[in-house]
């Protein structure tokens, strides 16, 4: 089959721009750290890269391959008030490299981390 | 309590990186349109703007407020393979402006739209 | 359980139009996304179009300008107007819903038969 270039063209640029790569994404800190119910953050999110995007199979998944970590301090409340906002400092996870990888691979190394 | 011009210069920029506003994302445009399991598109994955980010407090969430539509033209893929790739049109909904809005006005807003 | 049920399948002329129509019964959530497959004779099934609650809308490139689909969610039916229909439009149409959640359901009618023969 015959396609118009141009098509081709804009298919070629969505491919780019949804790959594998690390992306800003905004963290919910509360949520990451699975803290207290009456334990809030200002900011309540960070923004930090993580990977994501699309690989090119069903059996492909977006890994990050390496990871930064970046320190960051926020004001955390505790409800009810018996103080003011507390500075605390947190270091998020914050991934550099990405690559598309097994489904297979990741679950065994997730698993061998886990028996170590 | 007086804290630090640093932080405070920090917490600010990360609540401005974090806000609710349209952001670049991937939409897997099989999971967006829930076809069948033997139906594939190429590329599986379309970049569009849809509202993310965080909100001041637990009871709002992050909404668009107007939307405009994206044209993409992807190559959808049937197996087992009996014929090639065919070309589809998919208009996306690409989200312009956002706003943190009450979850209850959002709940009301999605039942008056289902009621109509 | 939910159930979807076809109509407006016929046959019709070359040129003319049928709209077909899917409701479902069972759910009181609105599926996220709806959509039509069909299948010609010897064929394999092939999507048609598709709409989600977010507004996008997906047509194969043999039916756009011809074919339109809507919703109402009120109703839980999902439409397919097809207008200026060919002989290569005849097949049996399914109409397909998908519930979104943490573990995404989707369901199948059983098929609606369109002709189009002079």
């Known amino acids: 089959a015959h396609y118009n270039t141009e098509i081709l063209k804009s298919i070629d640029n969505e491919w780019r721009k949804t790959q594998c790569m690390p992306r800003e994404v905004c963290i919910d800190v509360g949520k990451e750290f699975g803290v207290a119910t009456n334990t809030f953050f200002k900011p309540p999110c960070v923004s930090v890269y993580r990977c994501g995007g699309c690989c090119n199979s069903e059996g492909l998944q977006c890994m990050n391959t390496s990871t930064s970590y970046l320190s960051k301090t926020l004001f955390e409340i505790t409800v009810p008030l018996s103080q003011g906002p507390k500075p605390v400092t947190i270091s998020f996870a914050n991934h550099t490299s990405c690559r598309c990888m097994s489904k297979l691979d990741v679950y065994r190394q997730v698993h061998s981390i886990i028996r170590r | 309590a007086h804290y630090n011009t640093e932080i405070l210069k920090s917490i600010d920029n990360e609540w401005r990186k974090t806000q609710c506003m349209p952001r670049e994302v991937c939409i897997d445009v099989g999971k967006e349109f829930g076809v069948a399991t033997n139906t594939f598109f190429k590329p599986p994955c379309v970049s569009v703007y849809r509202c993310g980010g965080c909100c001041n407090s637990e009871g709002l969430q992050c909404m668009n407020t107007s939307t405009s539509y994206l044209s993409k033209t992807l190559f959808e893929i049937t197996v087992p393979l009996s014929q090639g790739p065919k070309p589809v049109t998919i208009s996306f909904a690409n989200h312009t402006s956002c706003r943190c809005m009450s979850k209850l006005d959002v709940y009301r807003q999605v039942h008056s739209i289902i009621r109509r | 359980e939910v159930q979807l049920v076809e109509s407006g399948g016929g046959l019709v002329q070359p040129g003319g139009s049928l709209r077909l129509s899917c409701a479902a019964s069972?759910?009181?959530?609105?599926?996220?996304?709806m959509g039509w497959y069909r299948q010609a004779p010897g064929k394999q099934r092939e999507l048609v179009s598709a709409t989600t609650s977010g507004g996008s809308t997906l047509y194969a490139d043999s039916v756009k300008g011809r074919f339109t689909i809507s919703r109402d969610n009120s109703k839980n039916t999902v439409y397919l107007q097809m207008n200026s229909l060919r002989a290569e439009d005849t097949a049996v149409y399914y109409c397909?819903?998908?519930?979104?959640?943490?573990?995404?359901?989707?369901?199948w009618g059983q098929g609606t038969q369109v002709t189009v023969s002079s």
């Open positions: 069972g759910s009181s959530f609105s599926p996220y996304a």
């Open positions: 397909y819903m998908h519930w979104r959640g943490s573990d995404p359901e989707n369901y």
